[in-house]
Interface confidence: low
């Protein structure tokens, strides 16, 4: 019988001077057998909660509590979620400045409103800190003799162009 730690299974530890595979104590784990010590399980507390509990062979995994999201590998930090209309800065959640918006809950940055005129369109609905502007249909250019009437159709926001 090979008297070494090489045959130890995960979930155990083994000391070279006394090469016997021993179970990891509670709240410790060993994903590789034959190591001289088991590792202390990660504790998910405070802003963290358990995503996966610790076992003898794998560490606990944490996730952030409601209102926070993970940062870094293995969710090493929790960052506060911002509301729509805000973005996270070093000073915390800040309201989007005029002309910008963020429609995401928790993450994202404030982005500039769409410039409707670049597409030759009019602004149908003004933007807010939470919503982008809504662009209307393209502005059609006609000869001076053409009369244009905009007739509402299908309730608010529904428009058709008729050339009379």
């Amino acid at each position: 019988v090979q008297n070494s730690c090489d045959n130890c299974q995960p979930g155990t530890f083994c000391r070279k001077y006394n090469p016997v595979c021993k179970s990891c104590p509670p709240s410790t784990f060993s994903s590789i057998g034959g190591q001289p010590n088991c590792n202390i399980c990660r504790v998910c507390a405070g802003y963290f909660r358990f995503k996966k509990f610790c076992s003898s062979t794998h560490n606990a995994e944490c996730e952030c509590i409601e209102g926070f999201h993970c940062l870094g590998p293995q969710c090493t930090r929790c960052e506060k979620d911002c509301r729509p209309g805000q973005e996270l800065t070093k000073q915390g959640c800040k309201t989007c400045s005029l002309g910008t918006f963020n429609d995401q809950n928790g993450t994202g940055v404030c982005r500039p409103w769409t410039n409707c005129s670049l597409d030759g369109r009019s602004v149908l609905k003004t933007g807010t800190t939470e919503k982008d502007v809504v662009c209307g249909p393209p502005v059609v250019s006609f000869s001076p003799s053409t009369t244009i009437s905009v007739t509402p159709e299908g309730g608010p926001g529904g428009h058709s162009l008729q050339v009379l």
């Epitope: 179970s23 104590p25 509670p26 709240s27 410790t28 998910c44 358990f50 610790c54 606990a60």
Partner: antibody
Framework: QVQLQQSGAELVKPGSSVKISCKAS????????LHWIKQQPGNGLEWIGW????????YYNQKFNGKATLTADKSSTTAYMQLSSLTSEDSAVYFC???????????????????WGPGTMVTVSS | DTVLTQSPALAVSLGQRVTISCRAS??????MHWYQQKSGQQPKFLIY???NLESGVPSRFSGSGSGTDFTLTIDPVEADDIANYYC?????????FGSGTKLEIK
């Protein structure tokens, strides 16, 4: 109030296997470990092992390696223990037990059993 | 494995104070817990981590100790307390129980 319901008494022949069940109600089944404990007539208690129903992870008291197999079914919130190659030494009451504690603590533990099933009597006899 | 030693039986008069001891073969820090088991029933959890009373357990029960020596005290003893009492350690795997102490009435 957490309740653990166990299957009824079993009379089995030596060499055979038996599978007993433990159904959990009013219990965060996937977030708490479930333990199995043996009590021979007139004797003390022996911890067999645990199962984490969340991922099926198990840990056995070395004494029961190969004797007991622990499984769990998340959909029915039921844990099972199969005992194989039965002998008269396996005649006992088997309890399932749980605890309202997180699985990872430092310092160790507390790893106590604060609620228990009523037990299942297994009698091995020819 | 950590062996837990309990005296097999104790006789006590109702209304008196009784202490049930549990000695561990090596230090278990404060990770000792106590259970009560009445005949034909499942164990009932009483005390965790040496001295913390489980909610709903009468205050006449108390626990103390650390390292290797632990005690469960019942003061005063009532007729309803006649049962077996087990200690359990969770400092290392496998978890182990004491052999139990039977509380009897004088």
């Amino acid at each position: 109030q957490v309740q653990l319901q166990q299957s009824g008494a079993e009379l089995v022949k030596p060499g055979s296997s038996v599978k007993i069940s433990c159904k959990a109600s009013d219990y965060t089944f996937t977030s708490n470990f479930l333990h199995w404990i043996k009590q021979q007539p007139g004797n003390g208690l022996e911890w067999i092992g645990w199962i984490n129903p969340g991922d099926g992870d198990t840990y056995y008291n070395q004494k029961f390696n190969g004797k007991a197999t622990l499984t769990a079914d998340k959909s029915s919130t039921t844990a099972y223990m199969q005992l194989s190659s039965l002998t008269s030494e396996d005649s006992a009451v088997y309890f399932c037990a749980g605890g309202n504690y997180y699985a990872a603590h430092y310092p160790p533990g507390p790893w106590y059993f604060d609620f228990w099933g009523p037990g299942t009597m297994v009698t091995v006899s020819s | 494995d950590t062996v837990l030693t309990q005296s097999p039986a104790l006789a006590v008069s109702l209304g008196q104070r009784v202490t049930i001891s549990c000695r561990a073969s090596k230090s278990v820090s404060i990770y000792m817990h106590w259970y009560q088991q009445k005949s034909g029933q499942q164990p009932k959890f009483l005390i965790y981590t040496a001295s913390n009373l489980e909610s709903g357990v009468p205050s006449r029960f108390s626990g103390s100790g650390s390292g290797t020596d632990f005690t469960l005290t019942i003061d005063p003893v009532e007729a309803d307390d006649i049962a077996n009492y087990y200690c359990q350690q969770s400092n290392e795997l496998p978890f182990t129980f004491g052999s139990g102490t039977k509380l009897e009435i004088k």
